[in-house]
């Protein structure tokens, strides 16, 4: 169990930013923050819930835009943003810090939401290390922050996954629960068996190798499907495999915005303050009644207080309240390299030649779905289709009827009749062949290939 | 011209489950819009039921929400309601409409379809 | 749910005189992120479906005659048909689409 702990220094006009308020005159506002952590360093989707935690900060002071005036750093809220942690700390992690600004003004239906920045970090954190600091920019704005991980005793280490005892163990109380803030002194940690995993095990003799929850193995290297003590959190026994107390799942109030944690068989419960909710009270009380769908976007969930919602987004835009435009193109839905143009309303694609469809998925030199008429069969070559038609036939699809004696077909100045079946062609004397190409030799055998038997030469050769 | 055409069963028994279809001509349902159920009981006021994106999300009345499933058939252009355990109460005209996202208004009307809930 | 009350349920006026419907709602349909309110007025006439006339409270549809008007904010809503003519005996319903969707129980115009 742990602590992921943030810190706002600044919001502000970033460099060649905005160097005027980039708002019309309006009445009071404030900001706040939500902060959000998402385990992993991979690109999750922009929906997945904040398995790691979520919290909201408090409200910064009351200021007024001057739309006229230099645009100064926002007046902030007071304190860290916390967000507990119960199990191991990750160690890589995203981190999404949302700036909303509240305006204060005679609205009906109360005040309104809008979210003017939002920046991602995906980082690699040890837990117990120093502050480290960033600066992010989203758009003409510019966020300071800095953010640590510190485990909550007794949890240890860099992901808080090792327990420590104190020196004055008899001083602390049953079994492992944390100690007094002065007694955290923890023993160095005993040399485990060879071999012990350094991510799943942990000892607290010498040469012995115990497994975390969801462990087992002399090496604590094989993961454990079911387990009959599921639930409590903390060291497994040797001899049970069941796991000694660790630390409470209320210790330490995980639950957010001044929610009450009350504990429950494995688990806690936060019963959340109106206006949040969530399994730590870390979101904030926004609802359908707000009208929180940016873009047209439909809302949907309860209506009151303490419900949950989502958007239901139109075409083009995204995130939790569809204020994200969606640059469609960039998933590149053109096909055959179409031309990709995002119309606000709908996609559109330019096709290359030789490509249709509202996708340009439809190639029209493929043979696939392609007649060729009259008999003509279809061949593909070279990105191109063509058809080889039929005696008697020509053009692209072979719909034209062609003249099969116009292109002369036969040789050494026989002569061409047109029959239903194809050309039959009448050789000059001393050829013959289907197109009197072979020329006959003068003892009356001709050359290859040999006239087939009964065929005179001279005589009309019919051309299949 | 986006033409919209209830289809299904007149007569439904009750405790049944009412079936309709909805076949959408001159827009693709997978473009834009919400895909809507609207009912009119006989000489009463509109009901909206509920609704299926143009992406497939769903939302539905909560006072029928335990009843009603809504889907689509993108490859016919078509999106479906059903709802179960009929009573007669149910017996209404049934609309097909699209909503605009931009406007939140009920675009255009299917002409209806009248489904009789009686044994 | 929000809930959506019309009144009159039926209203009589005589042909070029002014029709007035009002509508209330249970809670605000103003949003202050778009500045909109979220309520539409729709024409149903005999064996037909509705029709759009109005959305956002005052906005009128492409195609409405502009003798159609709506106004209003917040929680009251009105719509009004400044010279009834004969073409406009109908239900008129309003409707509210700030949360999920719910409509008005109707109000039938006649001629006077």
């Known amino acids: 169990a742990g602590v992921f702990e943030l810190q706002i220094h600044s919001f502000g006009p970033g460099p060649g930013g905005a160097p005027r308020s980039p708002y019309s005159a309006r009445g009071p506002c404030r900001l706040f923050f939500r902060v959000c952590l998402k385990p992993g360093l991979s690109e999750e989707a922009a929906e997945s819930p904040c398995a790691l935690g979520a919290a909201l900060s408090a409200r910064g002071p009351v200021y007024t835009e001057q739309p006229e005036a230099p645009a100064p750093d926002l007046p902030l809220p007071n304190g860290l943003l916390q967000v507990p942690f119960r199990d191991a700390w990750p160690g890589t992690f995203s981190l999404i810090i949302e700036t909303w600004r509240e305006e204060l003004g005679d609205q009906i239906g109360g005040p309104a939401w809008s979210l003017l920045a939002r920046v991602t970090r995906r980082r690699r954190l040890a837990a117990g290390g120093p502050w480290a600091g960033d600066i992010q920019r989203a758009g003409a704005w510019e966020l300071r922050f800095s953010y640590r991980a510190r485990c909550e005793l007794p949890a240890v280490g860099t992901a808080c996954t090792r327990l420590c005892r104190p020196r004055s163990a008899s001083r602390c109380g049953p079994g492992l629960r944390p100690c007094a803030p002065l007694e955290d002194e923890c023993e160095a940690p005993p040399v485990c068996r060879a071999g012990c995993s350094l991510e799943h095990g942990f000892c607290e003799q010498p040469g012995e190798c115990r497994c975390l929850e969801g462990w087992t193995g002399p090496l604590c290297m094989v993961p454990v499907s079911t387990s009959s003590c599921l639930g409590l959190r903390g060291p497994s026994s040797t001899t049970t495999g069941c796991l000694v107390p660790g630390p409470g799942p209320c210790d330490g109030n995980p639950c957010a915005n001044g929610g009450s944690c009350s504990e429950t068989p494995g688990s806690f419960e936060c019963t959340c303050p109106r206006g949040f909710y969530g399994l730590r009270c870390e979101v904030s009380g926004v609802t359908c009644a707000d009208g929180p769908c940016f873009n047209g976007g439909l809302c949907v969930g309860g209506a009151d207080p303490d419900s949950a919602y989502i958007c239901h987004c139109p075409p083009g835009f995204q995130g939790s309240n569809c204020e994200k435009r969606v640059d469609r193109c960039s998933l590149q839905p053109c096909r055959n390299g179409g031309l990709c143009l995002d119309l606000g309303h709908a996609l559109r694609c330019r096709c290359r030649a030789g490509f249709a469809g509202p996708r340009c998925e439809h190639d029209l030199n493929d043979c696939a779905g392609r007649a060729c008429a009259n008999g003509g069969t279809c061949v593909e070559g070279g990105g191109a289709h063509r058809c080889s038609c039929a005696l008697g036939f020509g053009g692209r699809d072979c719909r034209e009827r062609a003249d099969p004696c116009a292109a002369r077909p036969c040789a050494h100045g026989g002569r061409c009749y047109a029959h239903f079946s194809g050309l039959v062609c009448a050789c000059a004397p001393g050829y013959m062949g289907a197109r009197c190409e072979f020329p006959v030799h003068p003892d009356g055998v001709s050359a290859l290939p040999a006239a087939p038997p009964g065929l005179r030469p001279g005589d009309p050769q019919r051309y299949p | 011209q986006v033409q919209l055409q209830e289809s299904g069963p007149g007569l439904v028994k009750p405790s049944e489950t009412l079936s309709l279809t909805c076949t959408v001509s001159g827009y693709s349902i997978t473009s834009d819009f919400y895909w809507n159920w609207i009912r009119q009981p006989p000489g009463k006021g509109l009901e909206w039921i509920g609704y299926i994106t143009y992406d497939g999300s769903t939302n539905y009345n909560p006072s029928l929400k335990s009843r009603v499933t809504i889907s689509r058939d993108t490859s016919k252009n078509q999106f479906s309601l059903k709802l179960s355990s009929v009573t007669a109460a149910d017996t209404a005209v049934y609309y097909c409409?699209?909503?605009?996202?931009?406007?939140?208004?009920?675009?255009?009307w299917g002409q209806g379809t009248l489904v009789t809930v009686s044994s | 749910d929000i809930v959506m009350t019309q009144s009159p349920d039926s209203l009589a006026v005589s042909l070029g005189e002014r029709a007035t419907i009002n509508c209330r709602s249970s809670?605000?349909?103003?949003?202050?992120?778009?500045?909109?309110?979220?309520l539409a007025w729709y024409q149903q006439k005999p064996g037909q479906p509705p029709k759009v006339l109005i959305y956002?409270?005052?906005t009128r549809e492409s195609g409405v005659p502009d003798r159609f008007s709506g106004s209003g904010s917040g929680t009251d809503f009105t719509l009004t048909i400044s010279s009834l003519q004969a073409e406009d005996v109908a239900v008129y319903y309003c409707e509210q689409s700030f949360y999920l969707f719910t409509f008005g129980q109707g109000t039938k115009v006649e001629i006077k």
């Open positions: 956002w409270a005052s």
């Open positions: 409409v699209y909503g605009d996202f931009n406007r939140h208004a009920m675009d255009y």
């Open positions: 809670q605000s349909l103003f949003n202050s992120r778009t500045r909109k309110n979220y």
